[in-house]
């Protein structure tokens, strides 16, 4: 199957955007559907026959001249300038700014909290299953299985630190070697990048915003996947990570350190612990084949317990089971021995919502999953709206320039490395790469940060999360110190190696190009984003897991042909774009393949059929809510439904619709104001700081 859909004529043109994305398109005009409309202008448009409004297919072919969709949008300021305001206006504006800041921080707080709850929800739903993945004995001999287990477990528990700590405890208790643990750590690195990809999905409402957000999120995925693609075979062949980290661990006489400082957790924990508290030891116990743990609930019930160590007499099947011959006796019928037991006395119950419900983990997990996703989505929308109203005019210009501008020549190259350090520092502060990259995603979406700048920040985030792990390792108890430190260092050097591969030389920054390609496809076919998520984080790892269980022969038998086909397609694609004359006429483009193998259009039709009915219902519901809301606030245009719903309404009223390019499917106030869609009366409430 062709890796890039809709590759009609292979032109040696690297700037050609794939899958009909809103980019520079082949300049051939298209039958009667041409329009002069460019982004954010109200030029006349040719009216066309209306496509089903719930279809995700592009409504028209792109205009001949369209701006690069990756250029940051100009966030226009419609407010009255600061200098033109009277004292009352300035005071009002000042308090409005303070109010917005408070709101922004509030939503940001609940956004981070919802990420924490989301992680807990995933652990409740899939934590035990994740633990059981680890109890597979084939991990020791099969690095590929270790890799996919790392991915699956981290995706299931939504926390690389949880999966890493399980690995550490397994290495400490000799259930796993460091060599076998390295691929799992690599997999955990991949798995952790799903969180910000999920966050990006929340911005699906606006095509251009979604394009940027999704590309910004998946740049992390591609970096991790590509790093593993290169470094796992290198590690299997040379064991360089194992050797380097072993030398470091052996050359230093480490003393147990302090715990890594919990900076963000200090603020979020008081809230999240009121929602749910988990006993994360259960997952580790399952991973270590503890049968009793399988029946334990992950929901923590008792928070205050008293542990007492005592010696008790216990019966044993035979004298062979005695702790020692001298501590063995009989009562005439049964054999007895003395055992040191630790018994836990429950003193005080935890204070969270689910403490007295006694619901199964799956039920609690499902409830929390739905609620946390709703809160996450709501907070994200509000953050984007607030940022949208704040970051306008000169404010936006200053911020964008500060973040996205390079140092002056000849130090321009240093900017990216500073961004890596900033990313690492910020991640160290918030103690979670997921939180940092998830917070970055909406900023990329609304156009505050470019993908080129987000890339080093994300790489830095990868480093930051490993420094946290190193600190945590140094705080480990004696027996776990060596193994946890070595694993944390493996994680660190893996990310350093990845950065060396995919960052220093601009030509090698493949993740950016791949993410942009995926962003383009996903902006046009939004269902493809979900498809990508399922394929890369669930289906591929599960398939490899299944094949690995079947044995090496099966894995190689299926894997080698698949890898061969992928390499063949990539080589062909490279030749088509670089030197097509080398190829026979038939292979110079993908037209020899059936349409469904080279384009997403046929698939889009299938998906549209499935989602159409649901979307109709959803929009009806949306319309009712919108009308109720508008009645309440007594303004007819204050609340607008999504583009899909507007189209539906207009289609039902039998009107002809002027079709806009994907870029104009905006839903943020700024764009509406810029296009004169929002009444002028609304703009007087807007104010800019400068």
């Amino acid at each position: 199957m062709a890796p890039w859909p809709e590759l009609g004529d292979a032109q040696p043109n690297p700037d050609k955007y794939l899958e009909g994305a809103a980019g520079q398109q082949p300049t051939a005009p298209d039958k009667s559907k041409e329009t002069n409309k460019t982004d954010n202008t109200e030029a006349p448009v040719t009216k066309i026959e209306l496509l089903p409004s719930y279809s995700t297919a592009t409504l028209i072919d792109e205009p001949t001249e369209v701006d690069d969709p990756w250029n940051l949008p100009t966030l226009q300021d419609s407010g009255i300038k600061w200098s033109e305001r009277d004292t009352k206006g300035k005071i009002l504006c000042f308090f409005q700014g303070i109010g917005r800041l408070i709101l922004l921080l509030g939503f940001l707080y609940f956004f981070v909290c919802s990420l924490d709850i989301l992680s807990s929800a995933f652990q409740l739903v899939g934590g035990k299953m994740a633990g059981q993945f680890f109890s597979n004995s084939s991990i020791m001999s099969n690095p590929l299985l270790g890799l996919v287990i790392g991915v699956l477990v981290t995706v299931l528990v939504q926390s690389s630190s949880t999966s890493t700590s399980i690995v550490v405890s397994m290495v400490s208790s000799s259930l796993l070697t460091v060599r076998a643990a390295i691929p799992i750590i690599m997999g955990a690195n991949i798995g952790t990048s799903i969180t910000n990809t999920i966050v990006a999905l929340m911005q699906v409402g606006d095509r251009s915003e979604f394009r940027r957000a999704f590309a910004g999120a998946t740049v992390h995925d591609f970096f991790n996947w590509l790093s593993v693609l290169v470094l796992l075979p290198v590690e299997v062949a040379t064991h360089y990570l194992e050797i380097i980290t072993q030398l470091i661990v052996e050359s230093f006489h480490f003393k147990n350190g302090e715990d890594a400082p919990d900076l963000l957790k200090v603020i979020t924990k008081p809230f999240t612990k009121l929602i749910v508290q988990l006993d994360k030891k259960v997952i580790s116990q399952i991973a270590m084949n503890d049968e009793k743990a399988k029946n334990k609930s992950l929901v923590k019930i008792w928070c205050k317990t008293f542990t007492n160590k005592t010696q008790i007499n216990v019966t044993v099947p035979s004298t062979a089971n005695c702790t020692s011959p001298s501590l063995c006796w009989t009562d005439g019928i049964q054999n007895w021995t003395m055992k040191n037991v630790t018994y836990k006395e429950n003193i005080a119950k935890c204070q969270h919502i689910f403490v007295n419900f006694h619901l199964p983990d799956l039920a609690v997990g499902t409830i929390l999953l739905i609620l946390s996703l709703l809160v996450l989505c709501g907070c994200l929308i509000m953050i984007v709206k607030i940022l949208g109203s704040v970051l306008k005019g000169q404010v936006a210009t200053v911020i964008k320039k500060t973040i996205n501008t390079d140092f002056p020549f000849p130090f321009a190259w240093l900017t990216g490395y500073l961004a890596i350090l900033v990313g690492a520092g910020m991640t160290f502060i918030v103690q979670s790469s997921s939180v940092f990259t998830s917070a970055l995603t909406p900023l990329i979406g609304i156009g505050v940060i470019t993908i080129e700048r987000a890339y080093p920040l994300t790489l830095g985030s990868n480093i930051g999360t490993t420094t946290t792990a190193i600190l945590a390792a140094l705080a480990s108890p004696g027996n776990a110190l060596r193994s946890s430190l070595q694993i944390a260092l493996c994680h660190f050097f893996f990310n350093i190696s990845g950065i060396l591969l995919w960052y220093p030389i601009p030509f090698t920054r493949l993740p950016i190009r791949m993410a942009k390609g995926l962003g383009n496809i996903s902006a046009k076919y939004r269902w493809f984003a979900v498809f990508y998520l399922i394929i890369f984080f669930f289906l591929i790892p599960l398939t490899v897991f299944g094949l690995s269980l079947a044995g090496w022969r099966v894995l190689v038998g299926v894997g080698v042909p698949v890898v061969f086909i992928i390499i063949l397609v990539l080589c062909l694609r490279l030749l088509q774009s670089r030197c097509p004359r080398v190829l026979p006429k038939k292979l110079q483009n993908w037209n020899f393949l059936p349409l469904w193998m080279r384009s997403l259009k046929p698939w889009d039709a299938v998906v549209s059929k499935f989602t159409g009915c649901f979307q109709m219902r959803c929009c009806c519901c949306c319309r009712v809510c919108c009308r109720a809301c508008c009645l309440l606030c007594d303004c007819p245009k204050c609340c607008r439904c999504s583009k899909c719903c507007e189209d539906l309404e207009e289609a039902q009223e039998g009107q002809d619709v002027p079709v806009k390019a994907p870029e104009t499917f905006d839903n943020i106030t700024i764009s509406r104001e810029a296009q004169g869609e929002v009444p002028a009366s609304d703009s007087k409430t807007e104010c800019t700081a400068l």
Epitope: N313, T319, P325, S326, L327, C328, W329, T330, D331, G332, I333, Q334, N335, W336
Partner: antibody
Framework: QVQLQQPGAELVKPGASVKMSCKTS????????MHWVKQTPGQGLEWIGA????????AYNQKFKGKATLTADKSSSTAYMQLSSLTSEASAVYYC????????????WGQGTSVIVSS | DIVMTQSHKFMSRSVGDRVRITCKAS??????VAWYQQKPGQSPKLLIY???TRHSGVPDRFTGSGSGTDFIFTISNVQSEDLADYFC?????????FGAGTKLELK
Amino acid sequence: QVQLQQPGAELVKPGASVKMSCKTSGYTFTTNNMHWVKQTPGQGLEWIGAIYPGSGATAYNQKFKGKATLTADKSSSTAYMQLSSLTSEASAVYYCARGMYGHGAMDYWGQGTSVIVSS
Amino acid sequence: DIVMTQSHKFMSRSVGDRVRITCKASQDVGTAVAWYQQKPGQSPKLLIYWATTRHSGVPDRFTGSGSGTDFIFTISNVQSEDLADYFCQQYSSNPLTFGAGTKLELK
């Protein structure tokens, strides 16, 4: 207080069987093991076996397996020992003794039943 | 079976004397040893268990010591009512076994 009552003496013919009783009072019969011990002037004290009345579980000294059968009646809090195919060597004093919970020391003993095997 | 050996069959002491009765196990029994007193015409009575622990109501002149294979039972201030047979018993493993007994007599 804890009491274990045994009949004073049993006179039996060789080859016959005897079932001696040990009626308990003053404690919960089902919580402690009941041991049976044989005492002869020549052999000293010999452990025959024990029964746990709670479950009816028994353990025997290999020497007395097949010779002695231990039973317990929870309703009357009485332990029984049946000795079969008696010979003159079975003539002795048989004690029932309560085992201390969790180990094999015997804290309370019956007065003993003197068994005389004689034709 | 574990054999419990009481080296002295008889011991003769005056009132107020100190008497030490020894018991040797054929293998390590830890501290799973009990001592009994049996007066003529009576049933045995538990004095010591776990080699050193006095049973309730037993006077403190009776003490036990030892672990592993060698055990000692001591009466520190012999009284006339202490004239009896003294048995050791192991309960380290089945079958439970007793020593042959040591008879304490008055001089």
